[in-house]
């Protein structure tokens, strides 16, 4: 008995081929024997089984001795054994018909779990495997699971169902619903204007939620919103935003906040955090601003860094076109008496310069002057 | 630790008037939107008014509007509740809450002052 | 004004048992809700905001769910000191509004 397998909703067809090579009689009959269609000279007559609108076949062929039963928008139900009656002979056929399912949406936030379901036929015992679009393998049997799904599993997932050493494929489009980067970090000068952009790693026709920016900063005993907003269809507008510091934000996607002063009592990490329209959960993205200070009281010369760095992060001064004075694993650094001139105060991590705050030093009798 | 502590409450006759306070220690008052908000005896929660940082916007439920006034005085760190015009239906216990919680939630309830407005 | 209706209004259950509450918005407020619990005789607490976040502190048997109107306060395995009362208020526009609140009953 031959096997083919099927994809729900696809078109099958069934193969009956004659040794005379020429229009004569035939029926194609379901396991209960009820007729499903066949001919009367050059006409198509159909019976009375289920399939009855979506059974056709190929007039065409019939003169050649092919007599196709094409079964449209395929059901798991349609799976049976199908028999072609063509001179006195009977050709069996076994139709099983899978279908593959995503859990609920194909739209997903990252971190959650994706669910892939397998529709069979009572009776068979398919293996399912599926290969995700970062080339992750995973393999089951009725129910496939992915936990704590990435940006990386967005795209198309391909996955083979196996029975009776014959496969199908199907393709499953995936989208992880996440921003670009999971955290980034702002270096600035005390003063500067700052500048936060939360791009998003999907499109969508129309993007709908709402959202808030949750700050810690360093010299702060505790955590406080700095500004909520909508999006509608994306476009933002702000509901309500902190006194101090007072954030801009952008009217358009991607999402864009504006400090208009680094200052170090705001030196900290963020999160913003993004609700979609009808998911539940949120998206997530780190945010962190590190701010530095350089200043000259006295007879002393100090640079300093407040906000998230790490330990390996070189904090130095040094005299332009000189080497530095001053070179620590630290986020303050001082010079007493330093001499007249240009002073740089680098944050720097194995080599790379992040951040740069320059102080003119003026000689003693006068006092110092900041670009 | 955050604490919020509501006095002021008492019996009041109907048309006549009251001031609650609410003294907030433990944060930075001056930081945060407060809010008060009412529930009638063996009935639900009712939101009343909230004020922002600065006491420039101020919001109200209608049934209280013209009647009852919030304010606050961040030097004191208190927020206050003027009532005037009392009705019967305004007796309650009404809760001082700080609007410090992530997606706007009143993360921190005084632990209530009752009113009560009767003849 | 956004009204806010809770159900069921009271509910009876044994320790161990799942809970589900239902809050519905009567316009969409999206992600701008809040689950508060309230004890007898004393001020209420927040359990979950933006809909389905867990405040710190808050034991993991509570969960939130939902987007737009309708939200879901699920407690998954009921314990003596969560009989109690439990909001649902939305911060979405003003005024704020709570729903009348589901009392949870020992059974």
């Known amino acids: 008995k031959k096997v083919v397998l099927g994809k729900k909703g696809d078109t099958v067809e069934l193969t009956c081929t004659a040794s005379q090579k020429k229009s004569i009689q035939f029926h194609w009959k379901n396991s209960n024997q009820i007729k499903i269609l066949g001919n009367q000279g050059s006409f198509l007559t159909k019976g009375p089984s289920k399939l009855n609108d979506r059974a056709d076949s190929r007039r065409s062929l019939w003169d050649q001795g092919n007599f196709p039963l094409i079964i449209k928008n395929l059901k798991i139900e349609d799976s049976d054994t199908y028999i072609c009656e063509v001179e006195d002979q009977k050709e069996e056929v076994q139709l099983l018909v899978f279908g593959l399912t995503a859990n609920s949406d194909t739209h997903l936030l990252q971190g959650q779990s994706l669910t892939l379901t397998l529709e069979s036929p009572p009776g068979s015992s398919p293996s399912v495997q599926c290969r995700s679009p970062r080339g992750k393998n995973i393999q089951g049997g009725k129910t496939l699971s992915v936990s704590q799904l990435e940006l990386q599993d967005s795209g198309t997932w391909t996955c083979t169902v196996l029975q009776n050493q014959k496969k199908v494929e199907f393709k499953i489009d995936i989208v992880v619903l996440a921003f670009q980067k999971a955290s980034s970090i702002v270096y600035k000068k005390e003063g500067e204007q700052v500048e936060f952009s939360f791009p998003l790693a999907f499109t969508v026709e129309k993007l709908t939620g709402s959202g808030e920016l949750w700050w810690q900063a360093e010299r702060a005993s505790s955590s406080k919103s700095w500004i909520t907003f909508d999006l509608k269809n994306k476009e933002v507008s702000v509901k309500r935003v902190t006194q101090d510091p007072k954030l801009q934000m952008g009217k358009k996607l991607p999402l864009h906040l504006t400090l208009p002063q680094a200052l170090p009592q705001y030196a900290g990490s963020g999160n913003l955090t993004l609700a979609l329209e009808a998911k539940t959960g949120k998206l997530h993205q780190e945010v962190n601003l590190v701010v530095m200070r350089a200043t000259q009281l006295q007879k002393n010369l100090t640079c300093e860094v407040w906000g998230p760095t790490s330990p390996k992060l070189m904090l130095s001064l040094k005299l332009e076109n000189k080497e530095a004075k001053v070179s620590k694993r630290e986020k303050a650094v001082w010079v007493l008496n330093p001499e007249a001139g240009m002073w740089q105060c680098l944050l720097s991590d194995s080599g790379q310069v992040l951040l740069e705050s320059n102080i003119k030093v003026l000689p003693t009798w006068s006092t110092p002057v900041q670009p | 630790e955050v604490q919020l502590v509501e006095s002021g409450g008492g019996l009041v006759q109907p048309g006549g008037s009251l001031r609650l306070s609410c003294a907030a220690s433990g944060f930075t008052f001056s930081s945060y939107w407060m809010s008060w908000v009412r529930q009638a005896p063996g009935k639900g929660l009712e939101w009343v008014a909230n004020?922002?940082?600065?006491?420039?916007?101020?919001y109200y439920v209608d049934s209280v509007k013209g009647r009852l006034t919030i304010s606050r005085d961040n030097a004191k760190n208190s927020l206050y509740l003027q009532m005037n015009s009392l009705r019967a239906e305004d007796t309650a216990v009404y809760f001082c809450?700080?609007?410090?919680?992530?997606?706007?939630?009143?993360?921190?309830w005084g632990q209530g002052a009752l009113v009560t407005v009767s003849s | 004004d956004i009204q806010m209706t809770q159900s069921p209004s009271s509910v009876s259950a044994s320790v161990g048992d799942r809970v589900s509450i239902t809050c519905r918005a009567s316009q969409g407020i999206s992600s701008w809700l809040a689950w508060y619990q309230q004890k007898p005789g004393k001020a209420p607490k927040i359990l979950i905001y933006g809909a389905s976040s867990l405040q710190s502190g808050v034991p993991s048997r509570f969960s939130g769910s939902g987007s737009g109107t309708d939200f879901t306060l699920t407690i998954s395995s009921l314990q003596p000191e969560d009989f109690a009362t439990y909001y649902c208020?939305?911060?979405?526009?003003?005024?704020?509004?709570f729903g009348q609140g589901t009392k949870v009953e020992i059974k």
């Open positions: 208020q939305q911060a979405n526009s003003f005024p704020w509004t």
């Open positions: 809450a700080r609007e410090g919680g992530q997606w706007l939630s009143l993360d921190y």
């Open positions: 004020i922002n940082e600065d006491g420039n916007e101020k």
